[in-house]
């Protein structure tokens, strides 16, 4: 028998520095977690103690903090090289800055293979990108070899900016021939490493003949055997065992997100490459693990540029950006409109001639808007200003909801109106009329939404049974501010870009902004 240790991360999302327990900015260092310096300490400790170790990443290193905004992926290549990752799969967020924003900072600089079997380049891009990422890589580990085959969510064209010259094929269809190729090369230990979410990970384990282990990402799935060490609630045991169609027991793992945990899986193979046993658990990277001093020093060196960036002008406003709680928790506020417009703009994807865009709607809890921006400071808007407006380090995500769920959400928005509570919704691509004289749960008298399958966008009444795409904060997707109906009834949820980054990019693009209050939210019967 031969034993392999798989160390794995996924959805790190630019958390190079240690973070608080909820993966936001570290405040009290003695209680902070994760970060590449701490990760390196643990990885090195395991490499010294165990003979056959692979360090793998299942995608979405890109996007999530000011580190990515400023360094645009160069930080990912630099620190992943420093940690000596063995392989990485491409995630959807790796395409956030377009294909060039993947090729130059990461693909050309990484000293480890970057993988995806289901992304096929065409046209002029084919010769430019081919060979910079691979469908599979065979890695020597001790006296054996392990094949790693990569995959990426086929939804990436709707979630990011891969352009028109990359085709995202069905994961299972694309993986099988690559695994078959590895088999013809006499590789009998094969790991599928990818970024399509836990449901697809399980399907790959079930359907792709020859895959021995699946290491996944995208869904931020936390698996754990025994008592979990922090706040995350396990979605199942670690590893999660899937019985394949050909009768094999295939371990499937994921390691939550944000570099908070290091996945740790031990696999025992027989000489034919069959999995005999698998066990392990994610390791919580808490403050009991010291940060490696050399990596920490490097982080501090790279940090200097971030501090300078925070105070640079992104663009100008010629109007007061009203982000006060007195406005945004009671009525339409122009800060809410600005943020929602930025959220839609960030999700412009012309992937189908029938649709002007795949999504037109935005909702945003008023309680998430934490500060106004005064235009009387020469109109200057900085990252620092935006960090005061959106201080929680969240993401603006894409969900699919039925019209009936949206209606419930808007009823919840005003169910206890007047108490300055955070659930009052700011909107984009939606016209809503409330009648506060009616009883809670029956106050939405008009709800019109902007069409997507149209060449000239116009507002149509919401249809209860129709499925709509909506951009919203991850806080709402997770049921925050009492929006349990969104969490319970959403049909799909894909995590998006860092909130501040979305707004800063929009302001930089527009250069000068002047959002108005324009009648997106109205109150009838003279109650307002």
């Amino acid at each position: 028998a031969w034993e392999l240790t798989i160390l794995h991360t996924n959805d790190v999302h630019s958390r190079l520095e240690q973070t608080s327990e909820d993966s936001s900015k570290c405040v009290n260092a003695s209680r902070c977690m994760g970060g590449v310096a701490r990760l390196f300490t643990k990885v090195q400790q395991i490499r010294r103690a165990e003979p056959n170790v692979l360090l793998l990443d299942a995608g979405d290193q890109y996007q999530g903090t000011i580190w990515f905004t400023v360094y645009k992926g160069a930080e990912v290549a630099h620190f992943m090289n420093a940690l000596r990752y063995d392989a990485m799969a491409l995630g959807n967020h790796e395409f956030d800055n377009g294909v060039e924003g993947l090729i130059e900072p990461l693909l050309k600089e990484a000293k480890f293979p970057i993988l995806s079997a289901n992304i096929k380049a065409k046209g002029p891009l084919a010769s430019q990108i081919s060979g910079l990422y691979l469908p599979y890589k065979v890695l020597p580990v001790g006296d054996e070899v392990v094949g790693i085959v990569g995959y990426t969510s086929k939804e990436t064209p709707f979630l990011s900016n891969p352009g028109t010259n990359l085709v995202f094929e069905d994961e299972i269809t694309a993986l099988q021939p690559e695994v078959d190729k590895l088999k013809t090369l006499n590789v009998n230990k094969i790991i599928a490493l990818g970024h399509s979410g836990f449901e697809m990970d399980k399907l790959i384990a079930q359907k792709v003949r020859g895959v021995d282990v699946v290491v996944g990402g995208h869904s931020n799935t936390f698996l754990y055997t025994g008592n979990p060490p922090s706040k995350e609630v396990p979605a199942g045991k670690y590893p999660f065992i899937v019985t394949s169609d050909d009768g094999r027991k295939v371990p499937v793992v994921q390691a939550y997100a944000f570099g908070k945990y290091l996945g740790y899986l031990k696999i025992e193979f027989d000489e034919r490459g069959n999995v005999i046993s698998s066990h392990g658990n994610p390791i919580l990277l808490n403050s009991s693990i010291p940060e490696d001093p050399s990596i920490k020093a490097d982080i501090n060196k790279w940090r200097i540029k971030l501090d300078n960036y925070s105070t640079q002008e992104l663009g100008k406003t010629i109007v007061y950006l009203d982000g006060s709680s007195q406005s945004c928790r009671f009525r339409e506020c122009n800060m809410g409109n600005l943020i929602c417009d930025a959220m839609i703009n960030n999700n412009l994807r012309h992937t189908d001639e029938m649709f002007w865009n795949h999504v037109s709607m935005c909702i945003l809890n008023g309680g998430g808007i934490r500060s106004p921006i005064d235009e009387r400071n020469n109109g200057t808007i900085t990252w620092e200003n935006l960090a005061a407006v959106l201080p929680f380090g969240g993401t603006f995500d894409l969900v699919q909801l039925k019209g009936s769920t949206l209606k419930k959400a808007f009823e919840h928005s005003v169910h206890r109106y007047g108490q300055s509570t955070g659930e009052f919704l700011q909107v984009g691509g939606i016209h809503v009329v409330y009648d506060l004289s009616r009883k809670p749960g029956d106050r939405v008298v008009k709800l019109d939404v902007l069409c997507t399958k149209c060449r000239v966008p116009s507002y149509d009444p919401l249809k209860m049974d129709e499925v709509y795409k909506v951009i919203l904060p991850n806080f709402l997707a997770n049921g925050g501010d009492g929006f349990q109906m969104i969490k319970d009834e959403l049909l799909r949820h894909d995590s998006g870009d860092q909130d501040i980054n979305v707004v800063s990019t929009y302001i930089s693009k527009m250069k000068v902004i002047y959002p108005a209050v324009e009648g997106r939210i109205k109150f009838s019967t003279g109650s307002h």
């Epitope: 096929k120 081919s130 060979g131 691979l134 006296d143 054996e144 078959d180 013809t184 006499n186």
Partner: antibody, heavy 117, light 107 residues
Framework: QAYLQQSGAELVRPGASVKMSCKAS????????MHWVKQTPRQGLEWIGA????????SYNQKFKGKATLTVDKSSSTAYMQLSSLTSEDSAVYFC??????????WGQGTSVTVSS | DIQMTQSPASLSASVGETVTITCRAS??????FAWYQQKQGKSPQLLVY???TLAEGVPSRFSGSGSGTQFSLKINSLQPEDFGSYYC?????????FGSGTKLEIK
Amino acid sequence: QAYLQQSGAELVRPGASVKMSCKASGYTFTSYNMHWVKQTPRQGLEWIGAIYPGNGDTSYNQKFKGKATLTVDKSSSTAYMQLSSLTSEDSAVYFCARYDYDAMDYWGQGTSVTVSS
Amino acid sequence: DIQMTQSPASLSASVGETVTITCRASENIYSYFAWYQQKQGKSPQLLVYNAKTLAEGVPSRFSGSGSGTQFSLKINSLQPEDFGSYYCQHHYGTPFTFGSGTKLEIK
């Protein structure tokens, strides 16, 4: 430094079989695939197949299935190729080569096989 | 099977010159690709792997480029010891196939 030593030239009759050897030294024999390649002036270099000494797994070019049989002896770090039912078309130089999944990085000196009556 | 089309079949050049040999794959083979040099009566020797990485001990006047379907081997400032035959090869699954070879001769 890896080194592959192949057995000497063979002169064989049509219809007969021949078994040639490739002795490996300077590396862990069981950790690398051993590939076999045929060279003739007419066809150039042709890949025959490969064997993984660790467990004996083989992979063959369809064209040489039934013609070539690959085996190993782990105790002596030696790979073997047997060619059966020989014809003049099988007259060639046969190379063994170590494959490290990036390329064939070390080659034997070749075994010349002449099939003649 | 993947076909490897190599050109030219033969090439005459003088010491000090620069030459380029090309190889085209019948389908995308990413960078699962290598170049070999073979001298008369000897076995092939690895020159370049992963399309552009020089094998150990190979002089820097050799360089490989390309990916996908188009590959090339460039030899700057030819030396007497560079004359011989050159072969390209893919290893994107089996069967591996080789190009038909380029014979580089002294002019």
